[in-house]
Interface confidence: medium
């Protein structure tokens, strides 16, 4: 159906509240440096305009595309040149080039300080004083820090955030109520951001086919009773939704996501028996619930995979006449039978199957050639299984902090050219896989661990792309999406690395370290560990353990001292000298 006014169409579909929220998110993701007040003003103006178009679709400018309207609005910002430099040049371009230009200037690492919550009474006063403004500020702060955040999901989290405050601001002990709830929400939001960034990277760097394959595998595991046609339909729609959100088309994205939720609920009988509860909820919760829904039980009567994909004499005909559809069916059938496999592994198996058919269908006797194809999957399955087993054992032995440090050492040796903050951030996140996945039952471990690692390694790839410093990182990031993790796992110590010059300033600590929260204290210590390794890349694990132990004792001693700053300035240089001597 063609609409006279696209903006009126979206305003009517989404409703004023969601419309305004999405516009605020869109502007905050594009102009990450602008103050909150500016964005509120822009969002208000666009919403008023949309409202007018909804009342009179043939009004002035109502027929313009959303990109034109949004771009024109962005280009009215007076401080564009000062704050964003060459991003202002985007305004010289015509659509669609102008929007592409804005997208290219999104900054994955804008360097804003972490969000620190004021004390609870002040927060509750602000919440009760102006709820809408309070939630708008939340949308703004998350969106500008995470320019690829999945916008409809951010609206859902803002709703959750509102719920937390509505409840906790009535509590006797506001701090005790807010603390754990806000922290739990923060964890979810950070994971959601990283997952969507991974989806956007798959679409942008590897194309629709890669994203669709990933989605077929994931949805086939989750909805094993649905047939391939149903999975394909949902995947096609889901791909459109994520393409829109990744491309900054947040209104279309949210609208299409709501349509997809509606479709799934209307067709739940042919998708999954687990959707009923989700489908009774309002739109934001419904979509979120569907995205997180538990896996359906496997149908009991699944025939052997071999019948269709190995024993059948028509395999090559099927493959050659419709390659993607045939491989999609294979992926679907394999995934629904193996909920315990990671999506990455399933995609590697499909790739191996494809390579086997490419080779065998060109021979004189294809059936003999591909007869053992399913047996050849064993090493591909064993590799992540062994990796998870070994690393979970290490995690159980060392705990999260110790495991993070082991990964820091591992990754710094693989790619010592990468910036220290990036190595610390990524290794800390990789280390969380232990806490997140190792306590799960055996049947869920691999899927949890490897798919989480893919998301974290994507963060490394995104940050590294901004300032490429290591050819081997570039190679692992760009060659194959599904083989990223094995590629990084397979990297050995970089023997070509020239050690960094020693800089005393890097190893100078002050009394402010003592008052930092535990997590930030860990980051300081881990930063020192990386710098130490960059200076002495040949250091053994034993030597590093000794030096880090001494360092921990030094921090503990000085933080307990009467004159903390004096202790740091006196004992610090001694520790550094001892460390240098120990690492010769």
């Amino acid at each position: 159906e063609a609409y006279k006014s696209e903006i009126a169409h979206r305003y009517n579909d989404l409703g004023e509240e969601h419309f305004r929220g999405l516009v605020l998110v869109a502007f905050s993701q594009y102009l990450q440096q602008c103050p909150f007040e500016d964005h509120v003003k822009l969002a208000k103006e666009v919403t008023e305009f949309a409202k007018a178009c909804a009342a009179e679709e043939s009004g002035a400018n109502c027929d313009k595309s959303l990109h034109t309207l949004f771009g024109d609005k962005l280009c009215t910002v007076a401080s564009l040149r000062d704050k964003y430099g060459d991003m202002a040049d985007c305004c010289e371009k015509q659509e669609p080039d102008r929007n592409e230009c804005f997208l290219a200037h999104k900054d994955d690492n804008p360097g804003f300080p972490p969000l620190v919550a004021p004390e609870p009474d002040a927060l509750c006063a602000a919440f009760q004083d102006n709820e809408q403004l309070f939630l708008g500020k939340y949308l703004y702060e998350i969106a500008r820090r995470h320019p690829y955040f999945y916008a409809p999901e951010l609206l859902y989290y803002a709703q959750q955030y509102k719920g937390v405050f509505a409840e906790c601001c009535q509590a006797a002990d506001k701090a005790a109520c807010l603390g754990p709830k806000i922290e739990a929400l923060r964890e979810k939001v950070l994971l959601s951001s990283a997952k969507e960034r991974f989806k956007c990277a798959s679409l942008q760097k590897f194309g629709d086919r890669a994203f669709k394959a990933w989605s077929v595998a994931r949805l086939s595991q989750r909805f094993p009773k649905a047939d391939f046609a149903e999975i394909s339909k949902v995947v096609t729609d889901l791909t459109k939704v994520h393409k829109e959100c990744c491309h900054g088309d947040l209104l279309e994205c949210a609208d299409d996501r709501a349509d997809l939720a509606k479709y799934m609920c209307e067709n739940q009988d042919s998708i999954s028996t687990k959707l009923k509860e989700c489908c009774d909820k309002p739109v934001l919760e419904k979509s979120q619930c569907l995205a997180e829904v538990e896996r359906d039980e496997l149908p009991g009567d699944l025939p052997s995979l071999a019948a269709d994909f190995v024993e059948d004499k028509e395999v090559c005909k099927n493959y050659q006449e419709a390659k993607d559809v045939f491989l999609g069916t294979f992926l679907y059938e394999y995934a629904r039978r193996h909920p315990e496999y990671s999506v990455s592994l399933l995609l590697r198996l499909a790739k191996e199957y494809e390579a086997t058919l490419e080779k065998c269908c060109a021979t004189d006797d294809p059936p003999t050639c591909y007869a053992k194809v399913l047996d050849e999957f064993k090493p591909l399955v064993d590799e992540p299984q062994n990796l998870v087993k070994t690393n979970c054992e290490l995690f159980e032995k060392l705990g999260e902090y110790g495991f993070q440090n082991a990964l820091l050492v591992r990754y710094t040796k693989k790619a010592p050219q990468v910036s220290t903050p990036t190595l610390v951030e990524v290794s800390r996140k990789l280390g969380k896989v232990g806490t997140k996945c190792c306590k799960k039952p055996e049947s869920e471990r691999m899927s949890c661990a490897e798919d989480f690692l893919s998301v974290v390694l994507n963060r490394l790839c995104v940050l590294h792309e901004k300032t490429p410093v290591s050819e081997r990182v570039t190679k692992c990031c760009s060659e194959s999406l599904v083989n990223r993790r094995p590629c990084f796992s397979g990297l050995e110590v970089d023997e070509t690395y020239v050690p960094k010059e020693f800089n005393a300033e890097t190893f100078t600590f002050h009394a402010d370290l003592c008052t930092l929260p535990e997590a930030e204290k860990q980051v300081k210590k881990q930063t020192a560990l990386v710098e130490l390794l960059k200076h002495k890349p040949k250091a053994t694990d034993e030597q590093l353990k000794t030096v880090m132990g001494d360092f921990g004792a030094f921090v503990e001693k000085c933080c307990a001292a009467e004159n903390k700053e004096g202790c740091f300035s006196e004992e610090g240089p001694k520790l550094v000298a001892a460390a240098q001597a120990a690492l010769v």
Partner: nanobody, 126 residues
């Protein structure tokens, strides 16, 4: 669920033609891999022809190649089997079978088709 209903069978002379139809309900036929099987008295059920769902790849048993044509009309949600140059050995009950959500027929094995019609009798005799 998929319901299938065959029609168009009957008595025909050798060398004659017949067109069988199979009306599907409960699922769009273009999303479903469908096939015709036949069973002659005292014999195993055998694959005759098939067509992929989502992609129109057709398959034929060697014994009917060049004589039979499988097709479907998505707007009518119906599958057809056009049978020309009929021979006495084509006499059998013809069944329509479906594998929903399968984009390709990847098997001629009857057991892999969960949905079947009740069959229509074709007799080729002078």
């Amino acid at each position: 669920e998929v319901q299938l209903l065959e029609s168009g069978g009957g008595l025909v002379q050798p060398g004659g033609s017949l067109r069988l139809s199979c009306a599907a309900s409960g699922r769009y036929i273009d999303e479903t891999a469908v096939a015709w099987f036949r069973q002659a008295p005292g014999k195993e059920r055998e694959f005759v022809a098939g067509i992929g769902g989502g992609v129109d790849i057709t398959y034929y048993a060697d014994s009917v190649k060049g004589r039979f044509t499988i097709s479907r009309d998505n707007s009518k949600n119906t599958l057809y089997l056009q049978m020309n140059s009929l021979r006495p050995e084509d006499t059998a009950v013809y069944y329509c079978a479906a594998r929903p959500g399968r984009p390709l027929i990847t098997s001629k094995v009857a057991d892999l088709y969960p949905y079947w019609g009740q069959g229509t009798l074709v007799t080729v005799s002078s």
